[in-house]
């Protein structure tokens, strides 16, 4: 009972952490910035990975995307490619963990099919909580980045003098949405992890070996695996069988019609 | 790296009308401020018309009902129509505009002047 809880749970988490990951990856919000030393009107700034924004105190608003691909930073890139590799592998274990649920029957799958299945997913849910994650932080270290190194430095230009405005871009809600959805996926992918180790089949405790009987007079008992462990009625010691354990000239002995495999 | 390319500078009477404009290019994501400056032989720079994406405008006070200042967003262009000019308006007009220049950085860029004389 335990288990299907912590793998249900584990499902649900994951489950909310990549919808997250999806809206972060979608919102604008990722930079914000107000830009109110203006003397025509005051501007709000905000960017996201695939367009920039502006809104005026007006309540106008233009956005324009970055259509081309050559003039990006790197580092957008690398965000971008994190974001998307993320969403992926969260959606592909999302699907592998809908089959994996201890709750849903599908066929005569066995247990230990649903544990790799389960153990499959929550690496896949960590791994894509971890992209989120480093994704997030990457653009959040590229706005320090840019903050500090835009210290009210003036150059002359082609076209004239052009003066960095020093003004702080803050983090935006996307960033915090992209942490958390990542913590939660990542969070997700533990539970599942863990609650495949309660999924797997417990190893039986005799290994799967020949079994010889040691003479002809000597019969395979079902009784005999109790006798080798002291629960059984063989008190005198007798030994019933040598527990397959014999060296390679013994094994090559001749057959005899009371040899079990 | 973003420039500025200023025209419509001239000599002209007073009482007449000059247009000039202001395109911006190279590599930037938004421009949500253009305007123009002015700078007086021996006076200091002042506001003379502005505008943002969204078209709200501002104007000098000195300037206000002579000039109009409007804008192509498609092309990244401003212009200052100056009409009814006095020879008090005779000045270096500058172009101005805010960039938003990339992720969590943006710049403020001058363009090199044009001479506006009324006489």
């Known amino acids: 009972m335990a288990v299907t809880a912590c793998q249900g749970l584990g499902f649900v988490v994951s489950l909310i952490g990549i919808a997250g990951i999806i809206a972060a990856t979608c919102m604008d919000q990722w930079s914000t910035q107000d830009l109110y030393n203006n003397p025509v009107t005051a501007v709000f700034n905000y960017q996201g990975l695939w367009r920039s924004c502006v809104r005026e105190s007006s309540g106008f608003t233009e956005c324009r995307g970055y259509f081309t691909l050559l003039g990006l930073p790197a580092m957008l890139q690398a965000v971008r490619a994190l974001m998307i590799v993320g969403i992926v592998l969260g959606a592909i274990g999302l699907l592998v963990s809908i089959f994996a649920l201890k709750c849903i029957r599908i066929g005569s799958m066995e247990d230990s099919a649903k544990a790799n299945m389960t153990l499959t997913s929550g690496i896949m849910f960590i791994v894509s909580g971890l992209c989120a994650i480093a994704g997030v932080s990457v653009f959040a270290n590229m706005l320090v980045t840019n903050f500090w190194m835009s210290t009210a430095n003036m150059y002359t230009g082609m076209g004239g003098m052009v003066q960095t405005v020093q003004t702080r871009y803050t983090f935006g809600a996307a960033l915090f949405v992209g942490w958390v959805a990542g913590g939660l996926t990542l969070i997700g992918g533990v539970m599942m992890c863990i609650a495949c180790r309660g999924l797997a089949p417990e190893e039986t405790n005799y290994k799967a070996v020949s079994y010889h009987a040691s003479g002809h007079s000597v019969a395979y008992k079902p009784g005999g695996f109790k006798a080798s462990t002291g629960f059984g009625s063989n008190t005198k010691n007798k030994k019933i069988y040598d527990g397959g354990a014999r060296t390679e000239d013994e094994v090559q002995s001749y057959p005899s019609k009371h040899d079990y495999v | 790296q973003v420039q500025l390319q200023e025209s419509g500078g001239g000599l002209v009477q007073p009482g007449g009308s000059l247009r000039l404009s202001c395109a911006a290019s190279g590599t930037f994501f938004n421009i949500p401020v253009m305007g123009w400056y002015r700078q007086a032989p021996g006076k200091q720079r002042e506001l003379v018309a502005g505008?943002?994406?969204?078209?709200?405008?501002n104007y000098g006070d000195s300037v206000k009902g002579r000039f109009t200042i409007s804008r192509d967003n498609a092309k990244n262009t401003v212009y200052l129509q100056m009409n009814s000019l006095k020879p008090e308006d005779t000045a270096v007009y500058y172009c101005n505009v805010l960039v938003i220049s990339g992720i969590g950085s943006h710049l403020e860029v001058w363009g090199q002047g044009t001479l506006v004389t009324v006489s």
């Open positions: 505008i943002s994406t969204g078209g709200t405008t």
